[in-house]
Structure formats: structure tokens, C-alpha cells
């Protein structure tokens, strides 16, 4: 018969390393007689025999953790007691080893330039993972502004435009590496004007381009203000490159103005705005420029449709609120006056009035009306319409022809340019060219009137040379 023997632990517990979800086993080999009772504790708390997470075999000498969790980390002790002598105990640690895991990954961040940005990256793992960051394709270097915190988060002080980009954090230990998803750091930059428009002093009718360049993130929009109101005319060209917007406002200058470039961008619910202004002043506001202000365009009306050269440009005088309508009304009123004139005079007078009210136009930098050639005017006045002209002049002097539009809009022939001085400076009347053989058969004008320098009327040519401005009144 065996002699009683107090328990002796022959294989003391050792530190066990185990990966999460793997099996971990502690061996507590005991020699004793009679057979001992063996109990197990974790961090001094008894492990119950019926706890399904554990398996206790070999009379209690073998403790197996069936699927290790990170919370199983701790000190495991086995205690053997058989009533002979005292109980014996051996302890060992379970170190739960864990591949790196990112528990709080970074998220997309929008931040205004100059503020502080923090991209989180909280990790788990055993051994404790080291955390580094990648920007784009390369490892991010820490500096006085950029630091990886103890927690793994990335802190960027005084965020700059160049900090914008794609970031990911990397958690690494001896068991492996974990990568976060790529996140975007967007640096929003308040709108700022890089190049302000320059002031100009130009001649009337010049084209001026005002240029305004702004930067921001998001790219700003640029709007233009003229004397406090949105610019209503002029063409705007915009070009965007690398967060910089370049806006060019082309203007046809007919009046001085204060032009303001406004660059705006949005940050969440708030807007940032930058402004810069320039003045456009007009040098040499000459009388003729003031009086001849207008534009060239095709005639769309009805009254002079059959008289004016098809497709030619005519001058519209912007001293009228609606030049097209005002001039059409003038000519309509004038034609009503012509109903009573002779069949010989009427077509010539219509040609004269239409070409006087809708003068051929040279659409240069300053749109310029081309007055009727003096010789053609005199031909109508002293040949085709001699009687009517005399009668009309008499009535006019007595105030009989006065109407809401002053006088019947006939030109003063003597003030018109002569085709002999500069054939390109005035307009011929095609009707008279067509009738030139009739003109030469007219009886002589009485000596009291100036003799007409009847032109050897040349073939009509449309010339668009710039001529001196000519007032239509």
C-alpha cells in the first residue's frame, strides 16, 4: 500500500502566448497520493468547471481555453490539494497576442486653411502596434506641424493647401499589419484675389478687358459689378486651373464706371468673399463722340425696306431710349408727309430720308454713321424735289412743319461731306445712280439758287471707311 504523499507540482506553469481565436493550454503536472483536487483561477477568480469556454482534463491538470479572446489576458494559477500537507500553487501568464486591428479608422475631413486637423486612428493589438501614416503613395514624415499622437491619431497644426490629399494609417506589430481605408483631407481656402483688375483711362468706344484672378478651395466663382449693379453687357470669359480662376470682362466703353470683381466660395453653410475694384474713365469726351453714340446693325423695319441696300449695316442712335423703334417712327411720320409730293420727287425723297435716318454704318471701335454725299442731297433738293423743298422750307420757317420730333428729318445739304473730297466718307443714293440719265435732262436751276454740282454719279459702291461722326438731327 502506497504511503500518503503531499502534492508536488512537477511542471510549473509558464507564460503562454496565444493568438485570438486560437487554443491556449496550461499544464499543471502534479505528483501526490492520494490524487489531488486541482482548481484553476484567472486573476484570482475561480474558473468554474462547467464554463463552456474552458476544457479541464487529465484530472484537472490540463486547462484549455478553447477560443482565446483578448479579454482572456491575465494570470492563471493551478492549486493542488489532497489533504496531505498544504495546498500547492503554480502560476503563469496568458499573453493574448493580437494582429493589429484598427478600431477607430480615420474619416474624410474638410478643414479651413490655418486650422488644426486631427485624423483618428485608434488600434488594438498585442504587442501594441506602432502606427504610421501614408499620404498618397509615400510615408508621411513628421515635422513641427505634423505629428502622430500616442493614440495613433494624426494631428496637423496650421493646415496648409499642400496638406490636402489622401491619407491612410498603418498599424503594425510582429504578427502583422493593418491598413485603414483611404480618406480624403480637403483643405478649404478662403477666396482670395491674386490679381486685381487694373483701372483704365480710355477713349470713348474703346474695348477694355478687365482681368481678375482669384484662388480658393473650393474654386471661387467670380462675379462682376458695374456701379453697384450686376454687369448687364460685356462678355465674360473664365478659365480655371489648379484652384485658380481667371475671369476676363470685355467691355465696350461708352461711359465711365466703377467695376468690382467679387470672388466667392462656400465653406459648409458659410461663404467667404474677396473684392477688388477698378475704375474705367473716359479720356477726351468730345462733342462728336457724345452725339454720335450708337451701334451698327441690320435694318429690320418696314418703311425703308425697299430703299436701303439689302444686308447693309445702318447706324442706330442710342440717344433714343429704343433707337430702332424711334427711328422707325420718325421715318414713318416723314413718309406720311411725303404722300402729297409729286411722283418724281417722292422716290428720291424717300431714298434721301431713309439713308439719312438710317445712315450706312462703319462698325469700327466707334460705330460711325456715314452721311449722304452732299451732291446726292443737292440733287434731291434742287432737281427732283425743287418745288417741294422750297415749299417745305417756307412752311418750316413759319413753324408749320413743327411736330413732336422737331422738323421733318431732312439733312442740311451744305453740311454734308462732298464725294469729291473723299468718296469713301459719304453714302451714295442708289436710286439716284439708277436715275442719273434723268438728272442730266433737268432744266437749269434759276440763278437765285446755287447751281448744283451734279455728280457724274458713279456706280454705287458700299464703302465702310470710318468717317467723322455726323449728328442725325
Amino acid at each position: 500500500e502506497k504511503l500518503p504523499k503531499a502534492p508536488v507540482i512537477t511542471t510549473p506553469l509558464e507564460t503562454v502566448d496565444a493568438l485570438v481565436e486560437e487554443v491556449a493550454t496550461f499544464m499543471c503536472a502534479v505528483e501526490s497520493y492520494p490524487q489531488p483536487e486541482i482548481s484553476w483561477t484567472r486573476n484570482k477568480i475561480l474558473i468554474k468547471l462547467f464554463d463552456t469556454r474552458y476544457s479541464i482534463r487529465e484530472n484537472g491538470q490540463l486547462l484549455t481555453i478553447l477560443s482565446v479572446e483578448d479579454s482572456d489576458d491575465g494570470i492563471y494559477c493551478c492549486t493542488a490539494n489532497n489533504g496531505v500537507g498544504g495546498a500547492v500553487e503554480s502560476c503563469g501568464a496568458l499573453q493574448v497576442k493580437m494582429k493589429p486591428k484598427i478600431t477607430r479608422p480615420p474619416i474624410n475631413v474638410k478643414i479651413i486653411e490655418g486650422l488644426k486637423a486631427v485624423l483618428p486612428c485608434t488600434t488594438m493589438g498585442n504587442p501594441k502596434p506602432s502606427v504610421s501614416w501614408i499620404k498618397g503613395d509615400s510615408a508621411l514624415r513628421e515635422n513641427s506641424r505634423i505629428a502622430v499622437l500616442e493614440s495613433g491619431s494624426l494631428r496637423i497644426h496650421n493646415v496648409q493647401k499642400e496638406d490636402a490629399g489622401q491619407y491612410r494609417c498603418v498599424a503594425k506589430n510582429s504578427l502583422g499589419t493593418a491598413y485603414s481605408k483611404l480618406v480624403k483631407l480637403e483643405v478649404e481656402v478662403f477666396a482670395r484675389i491674386l490679381r486685381a483688375p487694373e483701372s483704365h483711362n480710355v477713349t470713348f468706344g474703346s474695348f477694355v478687358t478687365l482681368r481678375c484672378t482669384a484662388i480658393g478651395m473650393p474654386v471661387p466663382t467670380i462675379s462682376w459689378i458695374e456701379n453697384g449693379n450686376a454687369v448687364s453687357s460685356g462678355s465674360i470669359q473664365e478659365n480655371v486651373k489648379d484652384r485658380v480662376i481667371d475671369s476676363r470682362l470685355q467691355l465696350f466703353i461708352t461711359k465711365p464706371g466703377l467695376y468690382t470683381c467679387i470672388a466667392t466660395n462656400k465653406h459648409g453653410e458659410k461663404f467667404s468673399t474677396a473684392k477688388a475694384a477698378a475704375t474705367v474713365s473716359i479720356a477726351e469726351w468730345s462733342k462728336s463722340q457724345k452725339e454720335s453714340k450708337g451701334y451698327c446693325a441690320q435694318y429690320r423695319g418696314e418703311v425703308c425696306d425697299a430703299v436701303l441696300v439689302k444686308d447693309s449695316l445702318v447706324f442706330f442712335n442710342t440717344s433714343y431710349p429704343d433707337p430702332e423703334e424711334a427711328q422707325e417712327l420718325l421715318i414713318h411720320t416723314a413718309w406720311n408727309e411725303l404722300k402729297a409730293v409729286s411722283p418724281l420727287c417722292r422716290p428720291a425723297a424717300e431714298a434721301l430720308l431713309c439713308n439719312h435716318l438710317f445712315q450706312e454704318c462703319s462698325p469700327g471701335v466707334l460705330p460711325t454713321p456715314m452721311p449722304i454725299c452732299r451732291e446726292y442731297c443737292l440733287a434731291v433738293k434742287e432737281l427732283f424735289c425743287a418745288k417741294e423743298w422750297l415749299a417745305m422750307e417756307g412752311k418750316t420757317h413759319r413753324g408749320l412743319y413743327r411736330s413732336g420730333m422737331h422738323f421733318l428729318p431732312v439733312p442740311e445739304c451744305s453740311k454734308l461731306p462732298s464725294m469729291h473730297q473723299d468718296p469713301t466718307a459719304c453714302t451714295r443714293l442708289p436710286y439716284l445712280d439708277y436715275k442719273k440719265e434723268n438728272i442730266t435732262t433737268f432744266p437749269s436751276i434759276t440763278s437765285s439758287k446755287p447751281s448744283v454740282d451734279i455728280p457724274n454719279l458713279p456706280a454705287s459702291t458700299s464703302s465702310f471707311a470710318v468717317s467723322p461722326a455726323y449728328s442725325m438731327t
Epitope: 453687357s233 441690320q298 429690320r300 425696306d305 429704343d322 422707325e328
Partner: antibody, heavy 121, light 112 residues
């Protein structure tokens, strides 16, 4: 209040005729040019015809010349479009529109709500 | 017969700027075409916006402006608003033997 009210639209067989009217109110009718513009279902705008303030001239889109006639009665403040020899491609909403001035051509600054003309057999 | 061309569709963000253009299949748009611009929302009659290149009809907000840029007429909306979502048509006066007025095919503008 300025108003343009079209009437006379409806279903007509190819080759048939219709006369559209546009009653104007709220402005001096005989001071303004007028136009007819149409819009086929799901399509864009198409200018059809124009007339100046005094009815002295008339203008038409090439494809309706000889078939359509625009006219106006300034005393009745009414614009008309007589449409003959109608074709299926004339199916559209026809709008009466007012010019901003006397002459026939130019911007249209007021429009009626339109009348539907359907040409179908 | 020249065809008047417009972008079939364009989009703009609220508060953004968008430019719609109006060209001719042959030749350039000039002031002699007197470009006009119209807005049409679904189920409504058109409404005049701009006439003779750059003049605004009364009651039209100042964010709408017209111009001729290069060889095309242009309608610029500065600071677009949701109610600007509509079809936009340009109209050109044409003279080729006879007087004519031609609309473009229209641009569907979406305000995103």
C-alpha cells in the same frame, strides 16, 4: 393687366383649315408688332409668322408660305392666323406673342398661353 | 437656311455661374442678328429674358446677362437659383433674301 388669349385650335384632318384668333387686352394693340410661334409636343419653339403694328407687311416661315396668312384687326384688338392645307407636321401648340415695338421683328415680350392644333386623320 | 445651335443641356450648382451659347451653323452671330433669349418652364408659355444682345426685359433679375462672345451670342446666369431650372431658347433675326426669325433648339438647364 396685359393679356393675350388664343382660340380656334382643335383637331383637323390633313388638308383641312383652321383660323386662330388672339384677343389682346391691357395694352395699345395698334402700337405693337405681333407674331405667331408654335411648339410641337416635346420639341422647341418655332417662329411661324410676324406682322408689324399697322399690318403693312407680313412675314412667314418658308414651310408655311402660301398656306398660312397672318392678319390683324386693330379696331378689334385681334390677331389672326388663317391656316390652310394643314399637314401633320403643323401639329403644335400655337402661341400668340407681342413685340416690344412697332416693327414686325424683334424680341417677344409677352406671350399667350397657347392653343393646341392637332392635324391627324 | 442656317441652323441656330445651342447646347442641348447644361448643369450648374446653386450660386454658380453658367453661360449658354447660341451659334450659327454657318457664320457668326453678330449684333445684326439681334440675339434674344427666352426662358420656358414645363407647362408654361415662354418668357422674354434678353433682347437685342444685352438688354434685359423689365422684371428680369440682374443675374441674367447677354453678350456676344467670339462668334456666338451668350446668356450668362450669375448666381444661379433653383427656379432658373428651365429650357432656354435663343432667337435670331435672319436676313437671307427675306426676313426671318429663327429659334435655336433650346438648352435644358439643370440646377443641381
Amino acid at each position: 393687366e396685359l393679356q393675350l388669349v388664343e382660340s380656334g385650335g382643335g383637331l383637323v384632318q390633313p388638308g383641312g383649315s383652321l383660323r386662330l384668333s388672339c384677343a389682346a387686352s391691357g395694352f395699345t394693340f395698334d402700337d405693337y408688332g405681333m407674331s405667331w410661334v408654335r411648339q410641337a409636343p416635346g420639341k422647341g419653339l418655332e417662329w411661324v409668322s410676324a406682322i408689324p403694328w399697322n399690318g403693312g407687311s407680313t412675314y412667314y416661315k418658308e414651310s408655311v408660305k402660301g398656306r398660312f396668312t397672318i392678319s390683324r384687326d386693330n379696331a378689334k384688338k385681334t390677331l389672326y392666323l388663317q391656316m390652310n392645307s394643314l399637314k401633320s407636321e403643323d401639329t403644335a401648340v400655337y402661341y400668340c406673342a407681342k413685340r416690344s415695338g412697332r416693327i414686325a421683328f424683334g424680341a417677344l415680350d409677352a406671350w399667350g398661353q397657347g392653343t393646341l392644333v392637332t392635324v391627324s386623320s | 437656311q442656317a441652323v441656330v445651335t445651342q447646347e442641348p443641356s447644361l448643369s450648374v450648382s446653386p450660386g454658380g455661374t453658367v453661360t449658354l451659347t447660341c451659334g450659327l451653323s454657318s457664320g457668326s452671330v453678330t449684333s445684326s442678328n439681334y440675339p434674344d433669349w427666352y426662358q420656358q418652364t414645363p407647362g408654361q408659355a415662354p418668357r422674354g429674358l434678353i433682347y437685342s444682345t444685352d438688354s434685359r426685359h423689365s422684371g428680369v433679375p440682374s443675374r441674367f446677362s447677354g453678350s456676344i462672345s467670339g462668334n456666338k451670342a451668350a446668356l450668362t446666369i450669375t448666381g444661379a437659383q433653383s427656379e432658373d431650372e428651365a429650357d432656354y431658347y435663343c432667337g435670331l433675326y435672319m436676313y437671307s433674301g427675306s426676313k426671318n426669325y429663327v429659334f435655336g433648339g433650346g438648352t435644358k438647364l439643370t440646377v443641381l
